[in-house]
Structure formats: structure tokens, C-alpha cells
């Protein structure tokens, strides 16, 4: 089995995790994709997934998680906004391809969220305009319950993560099911 590696990202409460998962667009452009958390001794749990079939660049939001699948680019973007300490954990992107096992990432994201808002700009945001306009209408796609406990050996999509700047404005107007609660229960 292929050894899964992980990258550690240390963020402050309130910041945004921004992950870009590359995939072969000819193979997986319209496939359903998901963002999962992996807890010790448990099977991966799906927190959010794209629609089936996945819609091009159409944002899907579940709580504070936003997925955007860019078919033209072979890129799934995952954002977790207004991070909380309890969001800390191990995450991964997967591509569902039934009846085969999910197509998983080598690089998992080890997210560590600490208390206190950083006054130092994050490494990936330098815009003069950086307003995250979270859609007021939340699209919640039905996610398959099945996730394989086994590691796949085929070449997976690739992923990396960004940390947004502390001065990024998160506009939560008219959003009813965002924050105040952990991403998962």
C-alpha cells in the first residue's frame, strides 16, 4: 500500500484554511468529490461533498466548509472559514468513483488551530481586496456514506493548503448555519 503523508498547518482561530486538490480533469472532472476528517481509529468521515455529478465552479457550502470544483482546471478548492480550535484534526480530499474505492490523496492536511487571533498576515493572502462573500444560500449535496478504510495505490490527486490573512473579512450576512458550532459534531 502507498504510504500516505501529511502536511501540518498551524493556524489561529478565525483564519481560513484554503486547500487546492489537483486531479486529472479528463478522468474526474464531473466526479463527486469530498472533504473528510480522519479521527484516530475511525474510518474517514465525510464533512462535505460536491454534487453528483459535480458542477463546474459551483460553490457547495456545509456550515463553514466551502467546496468549489473547477472542472476546466482539474482543481477542487476547499475552504474552512472562521476556524475554531475544535476544527483541529487530520483532513483529506477524496474523489468518489463507485463501485471502485474512493480516489484518495497522498498529502493529508494536519490542521492545528490555536487560540488567539494572529496580527501577522498569513502567507498566502496579499490582496488589497479580500472579501470572502460566503453564499447566503447553502447547497448541501448528498454525500455517500461509504468510505474505504483501505489505502489506494493508484496515483491520487494532489493537495496543498493555504492560510488566509487575519485581516480577511468574512461576510456572514444572511447565513444561518455558519459558525457558532464545530464543523463536525
Amino acid at each position: 500500500a502507498t504510504k500516505l503523508t501529511e502536511e501540518k498547518y498551524e493556524l489561529k482561530e478565525g483564519q481560513t484554511l484554503d486547500v487546492k486538490c489537483d486531479y486529472t480533469l479528463e478522468k474526474f472532472a464531473s466526479s463527486q468529490k469530498a472533504w473528510q476528517i480522519i479521527r484516530d481509529g475511525e474510518m474517514p468521515k465525510t464533512l462535505a461533498c460536491t454534487e453528483r455529478p459535480s458542477k463546474n465552479s459551483h460553490p457547495v457550502q456545509v456550515g463553514r466548509i466551502i467546496l468549489e470544483d473547477y472542472h476546466d482546471h482539474g482543481l477542487l478548492r476547499v475552504r474552512m472559514v472562521n476556524l475554531q480550535v475544535e476544527d483541529s484534526g487530520l483532513y483529506q480530499c477524496v474523489i468518489y468513483q463507485p463501485p471502485k474505492e474512493p480516489h484518495m490523496l497522498f498529502d493529508r492536511i494536519r490542521l492545528v488551530v490555536t487560540k488567539g487571533f494572529s496580527g501577522t498576515p498569513g502567507s498566502n493572502e496579499n490582496s488589497t481586496q479580500n472579501v470572502y462573500k460566503i453564499p447566503p444560500t447553502t447547497t448541501k449535496a448528498l454525500c455517500p456514506l461509504y468510505t474505504s478504510p483501505r489505502t489506494v495505490t493508484q496515483a491520487p490527486p494532489k493537495s496543498t493548503a493555504d492560510v488566509s490573512t487575519p485581516d480577511s473579512e468574512i461576510n456572514l450576512t444572511n447565513v444561518t448555519d455558519i459558525i457558532r458550532v464545530p464543523v463536525f459534531n
Epitope: 489537483d22 473547477y70 476546466d72 493572502e125 496543498t160
Partner: antibody
């Protein structure tokens, strides 16, 4: 077929302004991030700015912040770069590119020369 | 800012031979790395993304590998049309940054 056609380049004096435009066709413009990348004569590639589909996220390289403004008109399938307070070091071929992180399609570029 | 360093600056190779180009990042970019080819007087063309995924229409002789800070672009058997300048680019963090380029010339 994806087509990106830049216009608006030319000779301008230091401190002057130019507005570059890019006409896009052959793909769903309103579903794509767009960017500008430049290349000084005989030099390498430099990213300038990126803009999300709905302009809710915009990013610039530090050297142009406060001087350049990227914008888009999804109704007209067009991308723009307003360049003010131009400097000699802004002299380059400016490419309109499809994508916000990596760049799948490129225009042929428009040359901007800043010189007195 | 993540600094991308390419080596060598110039690579002299005979047609039919293998070419190996290197790209190093000043900090980890995981697999968010792309390779471009640029011929004189032309715009760049995307070859590889996700460090190892070939872009649409790119011949199989082009392959990418690496993760983290060390990356390689390999052209298994150079064709005449492959002589050009090659750039790597990271897209993990803004500002997006390119390497200085490697010129692949005919030996």
C-alpha cells in the same frame, strides 16, 4: 477553442497610465478565475494579479498594489488591468491568462513600454 | 514569498536524449507545482500541474515528479520541437511565483 486577445498596450511615460483589456472566447468566462502575467524583455515570467469569477477575491503582487487594478465584465467576457503610476520596471509583455492559481490558457500578450 | 529556483540555467542536449530539469522551492509547496514551456516569440504553454499530472494534449514523453520542495521535469526523448525555455511555478501561496527558467538547447 479558447481564445484570449489582449489590447491596450503601447508606449507611455513614467507616471502615466494605461488600461489593458482582454477579450475571451471559447470557454465559459464567468466560471473561471482570470489573471495577468507579465514578462519583461528577455526575462522570466512574473505573476501580476488574479480575480475570482465574481470578483469577490482579488490578489496582486506586492510591487503593483495600489497602482494596478484588475477587473472583469462577465457580461462582455472581458478582463481588464488598469495601470497607474507606471514605472520603467513595468515594461513587459502582459499576458491575459485563464486560471487563478495555475494557467491553462494564455493570450499572445500586449507590449507595455514605459519610457521617457 | 516562496522563491522558486531552477537548475541548470541552460541544458544542452542532443535530440533523442533524456533531459532532466530541476526546480526547488524555498519552502514546501506540497504538490501545487506547474511546469510551462515557452518557445521564442510565443506565449507559455502549461505542461504539468499538480507536480505530476500532464495537462490536456501534452505528450507522454513529458513527466513531472516531486513533492514538497524538490521537483523534476523529465523529457524522456527530446524532439526538435522540445527545445525551448521551461518554467516552474508554485500555486500553493499568493503571491504566485515562477522559477527563473531553464533553457533547453540543442547540443
Amino acid at each position: 477553442e479558447v481564445q484570449l486577445v489582449e489590447s491596450g498596450g503601447g508606449l507611455v511615460q513614467p507616471g502615466g497610465s494605461l488600461r489593458l483589456s482582454c477579450a475571451a472566447s471559447g470557454f465559459t468566462f464567468s466560471s473561471n478565475w482570470m489573471s495577468w502575467v507579465r514578462q519583461a524583455p528577455g526575462k522570466g515570467l512574473d505573476w501580476v494579479a488574479s480575480i475570482k469569477q465574481d470578483a469577490s477575491e482579488i490578489y496582486y503582487v506586492e510591487s503593483v498594489k495600489g497602482r494596478f487594478t484588475i477587473s472583469r465584465d462577465n457580461a462582455k467576457n472581458s478582463l481588464h488591468l488598469q495601470m497607474n503610476s507606471l514605472r520603467a520596471e513595468d515594461t513587459a509583455v502582459y499576458y491575459c491568462v485563464r486560471g487563478g492559481w495555475r494557467f491553462e490558457s494564455w493570450g499572445q500578450g500586449t507590449l507595455v513600454t514605459v519610457s521617457s | 514569498e516562496i522563491v522558486m529556483t531552477q537548475s541548470p540555467a541552460t541544458l544542452s542536449v542532443s535530440p533523442g536524449e533524456r533531459a532532466t530539469l530541476s526546480c526547488r522551492a524555498s519552502q514546501s509547496v506540497s504538490s501545487n507545482l506547474a511546469w510551462y514551456q515557452q518557445k521564442p516569440g510565443q506565449a507559455p504553454r502549461l505542461l504539468i500541474y499538480g507536480a505530476s499530472i500532464r495537462a490536456t494534449g501534452i505528450p507522454a514523453r513529458f513527466s513531472g515528479s516531486g513533492s514538497g520542495t524538490e521537483f523534476t521535469l523529465t523529457i524522456s526523448s527530446l524532439q526538435s520541437e522540445d527545445f525551448a525555455v521551461y518554467y516552474c511555478q508554485q500555486y500553493k501561496n499568493f503571491p504566485l511565483t515562477f522559477g527563473g527558467g531553464t533553457k533547453v538547447e540543442i547540443k
